[in-house]
């Protein structure tokens, strides 16, 4: 008889995670008598996957009925494949021996690669908000995919971004890989409704990429603009002054009126008007009893937005014998000290 040969017909097999992998092996002879074993890897550190003679291998089933006298097919199927199962598998024929069987011949090996889907991309934005014209960074992470080849793209409102840096780890061979990408986005005033999307394409996704999103509303702060005006008089001894707070985001806003530097009233913005671009407007008014003032009054509208340093705008209300209805306004960025009268 010709000497027994161990034939592993496939050099490589690729299987999706969760599926079963069939590893084929055939002998050309029944002689010499002895069991076959399957190993992952070679050398002293090889891992026993299946032993025809003894042991319990719950994930392994034999393709043929190995106890048939004339069986020459020693293919196995491994169920519920994970990336950790990747490696080169060897079908090894042992020759009966006493007390122990002796390794007789090995197949050439079959490399099992596992196709594992990337996890859903997680996009995270900056820890603190930034104002328009500033650049913020968004990160995108996905894990557990194999093989290593992967494509990542960034979009802002459907437009592809180019300012990003991507790393796939580890650099060498691994059972699975992770991707990390950082994109730099320049904020604009209209970005409250904007969205950034991280899109990942991989062989396991069959042309249907995974997407992770982040809303720029979580990253942007649009500071308010202030306008203080005097409204027509309701009565001869009263002046109605309004503070229009416009185009701010997010909502959190506290307004304080000062008369000649002294706090008159503090209120928190409640009923806001939302603009089309997602920013908000709010108006506050102050009724001034002109009889209580001999001199001109400087009215200051001071706004603290989103925990930032206060901004203010002042208005000089003239007190005259004839209760004239005119004045001029003064703007102060974070001016907490009383405004000098005009």
């Amino acid at each position: 008889e010709d000497e027994l040969q161990v034939i592993q017909p496939e050099k490589s097999v690729s299987v999706a995670a969760g599926e079963s992998a069939t590893l084929r092996c055939a002998m050309t002879s029944l002689i010499p008598v002895g069991p076959i074993m399957w190993f992952r890897g070679a050398g002293a550190g090889r891992e026993l996957i299946y032993n025809q003679k003894e042991g319990h291998f719950p994930r392994v089933t034999t393709v043929s009925e190995l106890t048939k006298r004339n069986n020459l097919d020693f293919s196995i199927s491994i169920s519920n494949i994970t990336p950790a199962d990747a490696g080169t598998y060897y079908c090894v024929k042992f020759r009966k021996g006493s007390p122990d069987d002796v390794e007789f011949k090995s197949g050439a090996g079959t490399e099992l690669s596992v196709r594992a889907k990337p996890s859903a991309p997680v996009v995270s934005g900056p820890a603190v908000r930034a104002t328009p014209e500033h650049t913020v960074s968004f990160t995108c992470e996905s894990h557990g995919f194999s093989p290593r080849d992967i494509t990542l793209k960034w979009f802002k409102n459907g437009n592809e971004l180019s300012d990003f840096q991507t790393n796939v780890d580890p650099a060498g061979d691994s059972v699975s890989y992770s991707i990390h990408s950082t994109a730099r986005v320049v904020l604009t005033r209209g970005d409250v409704h904007s969205q950034v999307i991280c899109e990942i394409a991989h062989i396991t996704l069959q042309g249907d990429p995974l997407r992770g999103t982040a809303n720029l509303s979580e990253a942007i702060r649009v500071p308010p603009t202030l306008e203080v005006t005097q409204q027509p008089m309701r009565a001869e001894n009263q002046a109605n002054v309004t503070c229009q707070v416009s185009n701010f985001y997010p909502r959190g806003l506290q307004l304080t009126w000062l008369e000649n530097g002294n706090v008159s009233r503090t209120e928190t913005a409640s009923t806001l008007i939302e603009n089309k671009d997602g920013t908000y407007n709010w108006m506050s008014w102050l009724l001034v009893n002109t009889c209580a003032h001999r001199d001109d009054v400087v009215l200051t509208c001071q706004v603290e937005h989103d925990g930032q340093q206060a901004v203010s705008k002042s208005y000089a209300l003239e007190i005259s014998a004839h209760q004239k209805e005119h004045g001029s306004d003064i703007t102060h960025e974070a001016a907490l000290a009383p405004t000098a009268p005009l």
Partner: antibody
Framework: QVQLQQWGAGLLKPSETLSLTCAVY????????WNWIRQPPGKGLEWIGE???????NYNPSLKSRVIISVDTSKNQFSLKLSSVTAADTAVYYC??????????????????WGQGTTVTVSA | SYELTQSPSVSVSPGQTASITCSGD?????YAWWYQQKPGQSPVLVI????KRPSGIPERFSGSNSGNTATLTISGTQAMDEADYYC?????????FGGGTKLTVL
């Protein structure tokens, strides 16, 4: 351990069909091959063939054209039919079990338990 | 077809060691079985897979198999060991028996 009890016609005329049955008691029917062996008077043992629970058979090439071995798992029995017998088929016929169990592989199991034997005579 | 050859007879004195041989091409690459048959009785398996003894078989029975020869050894042979002994191996899913050896205990 498995026990085997066999029966069948002991006297046949040439060209008739020999028919023997072997009943299996004890053991797991699905972990055995079931054999038939014969021994002509004053001679050595000759293997006829075997069958397992799923009906997989192997036959001695010299007898293959005349032999049918079948199995009835519902009764835990297996049978031998040898057609067109001649005087040369006169022998003691034995059934025997080959237990293969979980640690077995091809050609690692032999005939561990034998039936009591049935003498078959072919004579005109 | 594969053939196994046994010497027709072996004689041994009680208490002595009897060696019964079985030869076949590269028999050591196969498993050998040994069966004992006493007159008027069914064969009994005494050695399986070259050198293993079934339960109930006395320790004086032992086996070996290498090269082209399998050997059944009976140490301290007793009168009750007088019988025909058959070796058996498998070839291409066919059981092959040796011609048998008659052991006579003098």
């Amino acid at each position: 351990q498995v026990q085997l009890q066999q029966w069948g016609a002991g006297l046949l005329k040439p060209s008739e069909t020999l028919s023997l049955t072997c009943a299996v008691y004890g053991g797991s029917f699905s972990t055995y091959y079931w054999n038939w062996i014969r021994q002509p008077p004053g001679k050595g043992l000759e293997w006829i063939g075997e069958i397992n629970h799923s009906g997989s058979t192997n036959y001695n090439p010299s007898l293959k054209s005349r032999v049918i071995i079948s199995v009835d798992t519902s009764k835990n029995q297996f049978s031998l039919k040898l057609s067109s017998v001649t005087a040369a088929d006169t022998a003691v016929y034995y059934c025997a079990s080959s237990h293969y169990g979980s640690g077995s592989f091809p050609d690692s199991y032999g005939m561990d338990v034998w039936g009591q034997g049935t003498t078959v005579t072919v004579s005109a | 077809s594969y053939e196994l050859t046994q010497s027709p007879s072996v004689s041994v004195s009680p208490g002595q060691t009897a060696s019964i041989t079985c030869s076949g091409d590269k028999l050591g690459d196969r498993y050998a079985w040994w069966y004992q048959q006493k007159p008027g009785q069914s064969p009994v398996l005494v050695i399986y897979q070259d050198d293993k003894r079934p339960s109930g078989i006395p320790e004086r029975f032992s086996g070996s198999n290498s090269g082209n020869t399998a050997t059944l050894t009976i140490s301290g042979t007793q009168a009750m060991d007088e019988a025909d002994y058959y070796c058996q191996a498998w070839d291409s899913s066919t059981a092959v028996f040796g011609g048998g050896t008659k052991l006579t205990v003098l």
